[in-house]
């Protein structure tokens, strides 16, 4: 039985250039203890999009909403979207480790597509 589920409810999101994109992520537990991070892409070349604990991410804000009793909200919003932001975004739970945290579970991903800015 899964001890924690990472839920990215939207497979895809389409946003007009210049607008903000909301990427949803919920988890069923805080356990195992460890940070939650957002990445664009998968594998070794993935790009860190947000880590609350460290780093500077001026375009990213957290958008926690009142969720169900049994879910924890780790959604983000990225402002001023450009075509360069297109890609698949993953919400990833890490487990605290020594010396380094270990990736525990990833959401299924949300593909962000960028529409041309309406003229």
């Amino acid at each position: 039985e899964d001890e924690l589920q990472v839920i990215q409810p939207e497979k895809s999101v389409s946003v007009a250039a210049g607008e903000s994109a909301t990427l949803r992520c919920a988890m069923t537990s805080l356990i195992p203890v460890g940070p939650i991070m957002w990445f664009r892409g998968a594998g070794a070349g993935r790009e860190l999009i947000y880590n609350q604990k460290e780093g500077h991410f001026p375009r990213v804000t957290t958008v926690s909403e009142l969720t169900k009793r049994n879910n924890l909200d780790f959604s983000i919003s990225i402002s001023n979207i450009t075509p360069a932001d297109a890609g698949t975004y993953y919400c990833v739970k890490f487990r605290k480790g020594s010396p380094d945290d270990v990736e525990f579970k990833s959401g299924a991903g949300t593909e962000l597509s960028v529409r041309a800015k309406p003229s």
Epitope: E1, D2, E3, L4, T28, S29, L30, I31, P32, V33, G34, P35, I36, Q52, T62, V63, S64, R69, N70, N71, L72, D73, F74, S75, I76, R95, K96
Partner: antibody, heavy 118, light 112 residues
Framework: EVQLVESGGGLVKPGGSLRLSCAAS????????MSWVRQTPGKGLEWVAT????????YYPSSVKGRFTLSRDNAKNSLYLQMNSLRAEDTAVYYC???????????WGQGTTVTVSS | DIVLTQSPASLAVSLGERATISCRAS??????????MHWYQQKPGQPPKLLIY???NLESGVPDRFSGSGSRTDFTLTINPLQAEDVATYYC??????????FGGGTKVEIK
């Protein structure tokens, strides 16, 4: 109705051991993170141990780490706290608590008293 | 460790009036905009009972005269109007992703 019933408390000498048990009913035990919290008149409430729903991950504060071991048997809807090398400062009422998301302690048992004294 | 400081330690309020309890954390207990701060009520001879989870969410079955507010480091539990059965000790508790999880020292609420 959720029920958590602790047992196993008692009087033990310093350096001794005790095993506390918590019998759960009225909810899907295997889906819940489980914890022990203790209460002393002097120190108030203190988190003692937490175990993940499947039993893979356990967490302890430094005050009990290496002396206490938390385990669970989901087939028996039971939680166990093995307490070794007990000290006078471990004297407290020990509560079993359940947590759906591992954040708040949603339900508590009535507690079992542990007294460590020579 | 995150230290939770509750104030006041004790509080006497007239029936029907508002009781306000403060809990201040030594560092933020917020994760992704959610405050991992919770409030419990404990009556003599009984275990603690969850009232408010994640700063402001009323636990099922808890009367709506109880409310919670705050974020990051400053949190408040409000009972309005206070009723006789609310005489108890109230504790805040943080469960951020930094161990150990900790409790405040408690606030004893009495009737004036």
């Amino acid at each position: 109705e959720v029920q958590l019933v602790e047992s196993g408390g008692g009087l033990v000498k310093p350096g001794g051991s005790l095993r506390l048990s918590c019998a759960a009913s009225g909810f899907t035990f295997s889906s819940y993170v489980m914890s022990w919290v203790r209460q002393t008149p002097g120190k108030g409430l203190e988190w003692v141990a937490t175990i993940s729903s499947g039993g893979t991950y356990t967490y302890y504060p430094s005050s009990v780490k290496g002396r206490f071991t938390l385990s669970r048997d989901n087939a028996k809807n039971s939680l166990y706290l093995q307490m070794n090398s007990l000290r006078a400062e471990d004297t407290a009422v020990y509560y079993c608590a359940s947590s759906l998301t591992g954040s708040s302690f949603d339900y508590w048992g009535q507690g079992t008293t542990v007294t460590v004294s020579s | 460790d995150i230290v939770l400081t509750q104030s006041p330690a004790s509080l006497a309020v007239s029936l029907g009036e508002r009781a306000t309890i403060s809990c201040r954390a030594s560092e933020s207990v917020d994760l992704y905009g959610t405050s991992f701060m919770h409030w419990y009520q404990q009556k003599p001879g009984q275990p603690p009972k969850l009232l408010i989870y994640r700063a402001s969410n009323l636990e099922s079955g808890v009367p709506d005269r109880f409310s919670g507010s705050g974020s990051r480091t400053d949190f408040t539990l409000t009972i309005n109007p206070l009723q006789a059965e609310d005489v108890a000790t109230y504790y805040c508790h943080q469960s951020s992703d930094e161990l150990p999880w900790t409790f405040g020292g408690g606030t004893k609420v009495e009737i004036k």
